[in-house]
Interface confidence: medium
Amino acid sequence: TPEVWVQVRMEATELSSFTIRCGFLGSGSISLVTVSWGGPNGAGGTTLAVLHPERGIRQWAPARQARWETQSSISLILEGSGASSPCANTTFCCKFASFPEGSWEACGSLPPSSDPGLSAPPTPAPILRAD
């Protein structure tokens, strides 16, 4: 059954910079990935990046660099300065649109006791929706 995992890491070199990694564990082909913060996209969350396998990538501040890591995983680096910068308890969500199953979403945040540069391994997070 499809699952989504989310990993959030604070960069050791820039304490207010975050890296979000998300992956899809399923057999469907990915049509779109949406990364948001502050909650699920469309449910109080704000879109940070949209990644389409063919049409390319769009990102919005404070996102600095969104990219595909593999055919089924992505990473996003966030700038850490300014009023819109994330904090340690910010929730990040990744929504994978997998054809034809629909959308699968999970959210994660920085592990409470993590040191800079460290994070929990990318284990599957609870799936919030499967449309």
Partner: antibody, heavy 122, light 106 residues
Framework: EVQLVQSGAEVKKPGASVKVSCKAS????????IYWVRQAPGQGLEWMGT????????SYNQKFRGRVTMTRDTSTSTVYMELSSLRSEDTAVYYC???????????????WGQGTLVTVSS | QIVLTQSPATLSLSPGERATLSCSAG?????MHWFQQKPGQAPRLLIY???NLASGVPARFSGSGSGTDYTLTISSLEPEDFAVYYC?????????FGQGTKLEIK
């Protein structure tokens, strides 16, 4: 207003093919996938397949693999479902449905066509 | 394919009563969706992703469950609720529907 309008009823002979159309209006056609469901008289619902209207990618129910073909015409915002080698058990109402959207939060199937009755009889 | 078994096949109740419809999956699924169908009409989405009310659906409808067992509940039946209800899974291809539960007036 969002609408899916299907083509009219068809009567076909066994072995023939039928092509049902589903014309979409009231929304951005390529934002939504379309899927097809059929319902034999007095029976339940059966998923036939889904087409991604943005790139014409398809996923079919293995039961119909080789007999069903789904296509789309973006210039007319129309999706087509063709079923070949018809047999009597293909007699059913065929529905198209607007499937999930990738830019808005969480709808599943929210709009359906009115259905097209296909009768297969010798 | 994942077989969905709905029970009961027919449920006879009166307006104002509580209706509980069950859907059992042959193997575990992430979520269940529920549709309502009235004679001569296309299906209508009621509940998506197990427990989320679709747009325009009255709050008397609710869904719950996990794994292989899912439930659709109608807290107090209205005359317009008498129809056939189908569960659907999208966790595994091919997508499948239950055989339906007919909710009829007692």
């Amino acid at each position: 207003e969002v609408q899916l309008v299907q083509s009219g009823a068809e009567v076909k002979k066994p072995g023939a093919s039928v092509k049902v159309s589903c014309k979409a209006s009231g929304y951005t056609f390529t934002d939504y996938w379309i899927y097809w469901v059929r319902q034999a008289p007095g029976q339940g619902l059966e998923w036939m397949g889904t087409i991604d209207t943005s790139d014409a990618k398809t996923s079919y129910n293995q039961k119909f693999r080789g007999r069903v073909t789904m296509t789309r015409d973006t210039s007319t915002s129309t999706v087509y479902m063709e079923l070949s080698s018809l047999r009597s058990e293909d007699t059913a109402v065929y529905y198209c449905a607007r499937d999930f959207i990738i830019t808005v939060n969480y709808p599943v199937v929210d709009y359906w066509g009115q259905g097209t009755l296909v009768t297969v009889s010798s | 394919q994942i077989v969905l078994t709905q029970s009961p096949a027919t449920l006879s109740l009166s307006p104002g009563e509580r209706a509980t419809l069950s859907c059992s999956a042959g193997s575990s699924v992430n979520y269940m969706h529920w549709f309502q169908q009235k004679p001569g009409q296309a299906p209508r989405l009621l509940i998506y992703s197990t427990s989320n009310l679709a747009s325009g659906v009255p709050a008397r409808f609710s869904g719950s469950g996990s794994g292989t067992d899912y439930t659709l509940t109608i807290s107090s039946l209205e005359p317009e609720d008498f129809a056939v209800y189908y569960c659907q899974q999208r966790s595994s291809l091919p997508f499948t529907f239950g055989q339906g539960t007919k909710l009829e007036i007692k």
